[in-house]
Interface confidence: low
């Protein structure tokens, strides 16, 4: 026996209170597939969320975050405060990256500078709070006649510019 609800298109719900007829989704609700027994309440983009796409009878609203915040989670389920480059967000707010770490984005955590010597390379450009070190050619590549690269100025390992 065919389920009478299977005839209900997107934008409607199978209303058991009314002999399983297909009733349109009421305002502020949607059903994105056919055969639904209930419409879902539209997402409301409130507070730090703002509306990227309005809800329709067949699709949910989509949110993003107000300036100064960025999306986290599937479908922007959370908004997290932006920090500046060179910082990370902690429970106590935005904090500068510790020595030897960097963050080149407004989100995420500070990550350790690359250890050039692990790849047998030298530091070409020192790291900062905002930027990773740039590794140069390996010392072997810098032997006379091996290449025309100008040897870098001596640098400490890991590279660091005074902050």
């Amino acid at each position: 026996l065919q389920d009478p609800c299977s005839n209900c298109p997107a934008g409607t719900f199978c209303d058991n209170n009314r002999n399983q007829i297909c009733s349109p989704c009421p305002p502020n609700s949607f059903s994105s597939a056919g055969g639904q027994r209930t419409c879902d309440i539209c997402r409301q983009c409130k507070g730090v969320f703002r509306t990227r796409k309005e809800c329709s009878s067949t699709s949910n609203a989509e949110c993003d975050c107000t300036p100064g915040f960025h999306c986290l989670g599937a479908g922007c389920s959370m908004c997290e405060q932006d920090c500046k480059q060179g910082q990370e967000l902690t429970k106590k707010g935005c904090k500068d990256c510790c020595f030897g770490t960097f963050n080149d984005q407004k989100r995420g955590i500070c990550r350790p500078w690359t250890n050039c010597s692990l790849d047998g390379k030298s530091v070409l450009v020192n790291g900062t709070k905002e930027r990773d070190v740039v590794c140069g050619p390996s010392p072997a590549d810098l032997s006379p006649g091996a290449s025309s690269v100008t040897p870098p100025a001596p640098a400490r390992e890991p590279g660091h510019s005074p902050q």
């Epitope: 719900f13 199978c14 209303d15 209170n17 009314r18 027994r37 209930t38």
Partner: antibody
Framework: QVQLVQSGAEVKKPGSSVKLSCKAS????????INWVKQAPGQGLEWIGN????????NYNQKFKDKATLTVDKSTSTAYMELSSLRSEDTAVYYC??????????????WGQGTTLTVSS | DIQMTQSPSSLSASLGERVTITCKAS??????LSWYQQKPGKAPKTLIY???RLVDGVPSRFSGSGSGQDFTLTISSLQPEDIATYYC?????????FGGGTKVEIK
């Protein structure tokens, strides 16, 4: 805040009728079903029926089809249940309770305080 | 009408004990089952709907499980305020039908 306030206790003679009321406030009355539930003394719960105030669409439990009549007055946000041909087995507490538009996510989320009906000669 | 068989009809448990109440439907009701708590002289209060969705404000010690015909309400650690009668309700089909109730008492 959402409230469902029911009429006071009733004592009725067998064979008579009674009309119980349930006044809603704090929400859009026409957007929620009003359900009626019976609880006989020391017994469990029985669903009598429901009504959608927006268009007065009703559903009844077959058991109560000839016993209960559900109506609403949208102007006063009040739901009514009339019980006819009263007998001693109609003695019970009657609750009104609301469910929202989508039957399959039904939750009786707010309840009236109940009306005690005693049928006695 | 769908019959809902609830067991046990009453139980006595110690404070802090785990309590389990079961409800069996006479036919498949998907997950369209809710649980209610009723204290003496009061209206019932919804705890769980759709078999396992906790109503806002209900303590997390309450949980629901099951689908099809067999369902369970669990109180993970019984508290004094949980003393009440608990009912299941199927709403897969009209008319919605309640289980017979389980009275929970303190041992």
């Amino acid at each position: 805040q959402v409230q469902l306030v029911q009429s006071g206790a009733e004592v009725k003679k067998p064979g008579s009728s009674v009309k119980l009321s349930c006044k809603a406030s704090g929400y859009t009355f026409s957007s929620y079903w009003i359900n009626w539930v019976k609880q006989a003394p020391g017994q469990g719960l029985e669903w009598i029926g429901n009504i959608y105030p927006s268009d007065s669409y009703t559903n009844y439990n077959q058991k109560f089809k000839d016993k209960a009549t559900l109506t609403v007055d949208k102007s006063t946000s009040t739901a009514y249940m009339e019980l006819s041909s009263l007998r001693s087995e109609d003695t019970a507490v009657y609750y009104c309770t609301r469910t929202w538009e989508f039957y399959y996510d039904s939750v009786f989320d707010y309840w009236g305080q109940g009306t005690t009906l005693t049928v006695s000669s | 009408d769908i019959q809902m068989t609830q067991s046990p009809s009453s139980l006595s448990a110690s404070l802090g004990e785990r309590v389990t109440i079961t409800c069996k439907a006479s036919q498949d009701i998907n997950s369209y089952l809710s649980w209610y708590q009723q204290k003496p002289g009061k209206a019932p209060k919804t705890l769980i709907y759709r078999a396992n969705r906790l109503v806002d404000g209900v303590p997390s010690r309450f949980s629901g499980s099951g689908s099809g015909q067999d369902f369970t309400l669990t109180i993970s650690s019984l508290q004094p305020e949980d003393i009440a009668t608990y009912y299941c309700l199927q709403y897969d089909e009209l008319p919605p039908t309640f289980g017979g109730g389980t009275k929970v008492e303190i041992k």
